[in-house]
């Protein structure tokens, strides 16, 4: 259930896709990745207020219990719902290879 | 990549499965669920320090960027890696039905 997409905290404050520019050095990849030298990392950032983009029943339960026991149960968290594949050119023992990663760039976000 | 299962913050402080006892009233289910009247909700709670139970490449990137830009990029978050099914007996318009929910109880946790 992809519940409410309206953010009660104000525009851009709730769970959504953000892009963060990162160099190979930032990512700790400089020794083994040749290209790209800079990555536009898409990630899920933002708050998950009550029922906002609730991923499933578990997220709905978490919201209810967080309201009751905020010190024990954390609020749902903004995480990727799906990913975009990304190709990296990387150094190997035998030379250079093309590697596709299916779990690197967030495509869509939800709260869980 | 299910990275390190050793918690550097001390026993039980990192992302792991917790059980929280909740009544139907707590969950807001009292009007439509007949049984069980109390649910042992298993959920993922705890910190996600560097590379602890990193779910995938995205989680590893998030850790690196959080270290560099803690005000912009949040740390990875402890969420279910898989679920246990749960059967609820629920009230319907025509009577009572048995319903299995596949996304209600966390079975295993990771950081993402």
């Amino acid at each position: 259930a992809r519940n409410g997409d309206h953010c009660p905290l104000g525009p851009g404050r709730c769970c959504r896709l953000h892009t963060v520019r990162a160099s190979l050095e930032d990512l700790g990849w400089a020794d083994w990745v040749l290209s790209p030298r800079e990555v536009q990392v898409t990630m899920c950032i933002g708050a998950c207020p009550s029922q906002f983009r609730a991923a499933n029943m578990h997220a709905q339960i978490k919201t209810s219990l967080h309201r009751l026991k905020p010190d024990t149960v954390p609020a749902p968290c903004c995480v990727p719902a799906s990913y975009n594949p990304m190709v990296l050119i990387q150094k190997t023992d035998t030379g250079v290879s093309l590697q596709t990663y299916d779990d690197l760039l967030a495509k869509d976000c939800h709260c869980i | 990549a299910r990275n390190g299962d050793h918690c550097p913050l001390g026993p039980g402080r990192c992302c792991r499965l917790h059980t929280v006892r909740a009544s139907l009233e707590d969950l807001g289910w009292a009007d439509w669920v007949l049984s069980p009247r109390e649910v042992q909700v298993t959920m993922c709670i705890g910190a996600c320090p560097s590379q602890f139970r990193a779910a995938n490449m995205h989680a590893q990137i998030k850790t690196s960027l959080h270290r560099l830009k803690p005000d912009t990029v949040p740390a990875p978050c402890c969420v279910p890696a898989s679920y246990n099914p749960m059967v609820l007996i629920q009230k319907t318009d025509t009577g009572v039905s048995l319903q299995t929910y596949d996304d209600l109880l966390a079975k295993d946790c990771h950081c993402i």
Partner: antibody, heavy 121, light 111 residues
Framework: QVTLKESGPGILQPSQTLSLTCSFS??????????VSWIRQPSGKGLEWLAH???????RYKSSLKSRLTISKDTSRNQVFLKITSVDTADTATYYC?????????????WGQGTTLTVSS | DIVLTQSPASLAVSLGQRATISCRAS??????????MHWFQQKPGQAPKLLIK???NLESGVPARFSGSGSGTDFTLNIHPVEGEDTATYYC?????????FGGGTKLEIK
């Protein structure tokens, strides 16, 4: 199996607009790091890179030709297009499209067989 | 723009001998770890074919008689031993930045 194939008008008169299509298969332009470039080669001469369209629709052009070039893509149909306005005899060449993998600093691993353009009055 | 200067413009090498082609860049195209220079072979009437990527890495399916070396601004393509089917024009190309540029080409003839 990756393939690319260029198509174009073959012959144009000076001042007309050239429209080229690159149809490809075996990869997707929705994959981060994938892109397609257009490169041309006048008969008996060297290779000249013209333009590039990336997976995220980032478009890059050779600066000296930028005002005349427009690159675009249709991701769902696996096609990349190039338009060159106000063609002249100097634009007579074989036009290639090539896949560039792995981001900006990647390499051209697959090329089409080329389409020949003659500009003549 | 980075200018790539190839030398010689043409060369004739006897069958079984070594062919050496140079490519000089107008600025460095290397980091401390990797070099962003590639080599292509083009036969008459055909599209260019990738031989070497990142200065020294042989593309899959390319015979081991082709090798590349160099860093910074100076790069070399070696073919040894040369075979009859190696008659072609060879181009270097950088991917250091946009615009990508190619060398002027070296025409190899087998004697």
């Amino acid at each position: 199996q990756v393939t690319l194939k260029e198509s174009g008008p073959g012959i144009l008169q000076p001042s007309q607009t050239l429209s080229l299509t690159c149809s490809f298969s075996g990869f997707s332009l929705s994959t981060s790091g994938m892109g397609v470039s257009w490169i041309r080669q006048p008969s008996g001469k060297g290779l000249e890179w013209l333009a590039h369209n990336d997976w995220d629709d980032d478009k890059r052009y050779k600066s000296s030709l930028k005002s005349r070039l427009t690159i675009s893509k249709d991701t769902s149909r696996n096609q990349v297009f190039l338009k060159i306005t106000s063609v002249d005899t100097a634009d007579t060449a074989t036009y290639y499209c090539a896949r560039r993998v792995g981001g900006l600093e990647g390499y051209f691993d697959y090329w089409g067989q080329g389409t020949t353009l003659t500009v003549s009055s | 723009d980075i200018v790539l200067t190839q030398s010689p413009a043409s060369l004739a090498v006897s069958l079984g001998q070594r062919a050496t082609i140079s490519c000089r860049a107008s600025q460095s195209v290397s980091t401390s770890r990797f070099s962003y220079m590639h080599w292509f072979q083009q036969k008459p009437g055909q599209a260019p074919k990738l031989l070497i990527k990142y200065a020294s890495n042989l593309e899959s399916g390319v015979p081991a008689r082709f090798s590349g070396s160099g860093s910074g601004t100076d790069f070399t393509l070696n073919i040894h031993p040369v075979e009859g089917e190696d008659t072609a024009t060879y181009y270097c190309q950088h991917s250091w930045e946009i615009p990508y540029t190619f060398g002027g080409g070296t025409k190899l003839e087998i004697k």
